[in-house]
């Protein structure tokens, strides 16, 4: 039985050219997290964090994606095309998979303030 919940940074905004932290957190379960996958809105795979093997950043994103903090992901040199949904998928044992959603809006405005908060989707 899957008892856990994924908390995410929810809807966030960041400046074009800047960076943003994508963060998910699995709570309310004792399941063992074996892997966390990060995907972009167009089905592109950004990165994987495996409990045994560490981080794998996909070649297409090596220049713009930094692992962490924790199981999260830092997306750098933001462009307007980065606007959209991002998904974290937690592979756990014995529960199975949990999935969280974050919506990122990249803003042109130089006065745009980075906003982030944890919420349960």
């Amino acid at each position: 039985m899957m008892t856990g919940t994924i908390e995410t940074t929810g809807n966030i905004s960041a400046k074009k050219g800047g960076s943003v932290i994508l963060q998910c957190h699995l709570s309310s379960t004792m399941a063992q997290v074996t892997q966390v996958n990060w995907e972009q809105h167009d089905h592109s795979l950004l990165a994987i964090r495996n409990a045994e093997l560490g981080w794998h950043i996909y070649p297409a994103f090596k220049d713009r994606v930094a692992p962490g903090p924790g199981l999260g992901l830092t997306l750098q040199s933001l462009t307007m095309n980065d606007t959209g949904e991002y998904f974290c998928t937690y592979h756990t044992y014995p529960d199975g998979t949990y999935r969280g959603r974050i919506f990122l809006e990249v803003l042109e405005s130089s006065v745009a303030e980075h906003s982030a908060r944890f919420q349960i989707p």
């Epitope: 074996t34 892997q35 995907e39 795979l45 045994e52 297409a60």
Partner: antibody, heavy 120, light 108 residues
Framework: QVQLVQSGAEVKKPGASVKVSCKAS????????ISWVRQAPGQGLEWMGW????????NYAQKLQGRVTMTTDTSTSTAYMELRSLRSDDTAVYYC?????????????WGQGTLVTVSS | AIQLTQSPSSLSASVGDRVTITCRAS??????LNWYQQKPGKAPKLLIY???SLQSGVPSRFSGSGSGTDFTLTISSLQPEDFATYYC??????????FGQGTRLEIK
């Protein structure tokens, strides 16, 4: 270099069991899983299941549930696949393959294959 | 289980040709699609993982693309050693990994 060396060919009668071994070397055995894939003569590839060498977690193909058991011996870096109640359509080459990343980045190293023939 | 359908099932081509093999999934598998090459009597060899990432040591004439349900393996300029059978594999559903039926690439 990474190597997976499998046990030799087997001939079995219907209803019998077979146990194929896969000895790994050249990497940290417990950091990866081992997947098993079989290929009947002239046919395509069929995934049989996976075992984590770290904690022994297993996933088996639904059609083989109850007939297959996968195990590992971390002291010898060896994985085993046992298939019971053999039938003629189990005749195939059985491959072990290294599978990290919860199998999601593909199987990057393979054993040489073990031919299992089931015949009365 | 997720079904993968490859096309064509077989094709003939000449050295130097550009060849494209497609793989269609019965449901969206994001980019969890891998490609393998297999020669007679040998184990499969991983060419492309995650739809478009080239496996270490694989020549750059091999490339992959696609996401969702439609994927493509392209060989930009066929070499004599490329004649083999090619399989796609989905790793989206790790509880039930499946392969395509294979595409046999023959010398014309």
């Amino acid at each position: 270099q990474v190597q997976l060396v499998q046990s030799g060919a087997e001939v079995k009668k219907p209803g019998a069991s077979v146990k194929v071994s896969c000895k790994a070397s050249g990497y940290t055995f417990t950091s990866y899983g081992i997947s098993w894939v079989r290929q009947a003569p002239g046919q395509g590839l069929e995934w049989m299941g996976w075992i984590s060498a770290y904690n022994g977690n297993t996933n088996y193909a639904q059609k083989l549930q109850g007939r297959v058991t996968m195990t590992t011996d971390t002291s010898t870096s060896t994985a085993y696949m046992e298939l019971r109640s053999l039938r003629s359509d189990d005749t195939a080459v059985y491959y072990c393959a290294r599978a990290g990343w919860e199998q999601q980045l593909g199987f990057d190293y393979w054993g040489q294959g073990t031919l299992v023939t089931v015949s009365s | 289980a997720i079904q993968l359908t490859q096309s064509p099932s077989s094709l003939s081509a000449s050295v130097g040709d550009r060849v494209t093999i497609t793989c269609r999934a019965s449901q969206s598998i994001s980019s969890y699609l891998n490609w393998y090459q297999q020669k007679p009597g040998k184990a499969p060899k991983l060419l492309i993982y995650a739809a478009s990432s080239l496996q270490s040591g694989v020549p750059s004439r091999f490339s992959g693309s696609g996401s969702g349900t439609d994927f493509t393996l392209t060989i930009s300029s066929l070499q004599p050693e490329d004649f083999a059978t090619y399989y796609c594999q989905q790793s989206y559903s790790t509880l039930a990994i499946t392969f395509g039926q294979g595409t046999r690439l023959e010398i014309k």
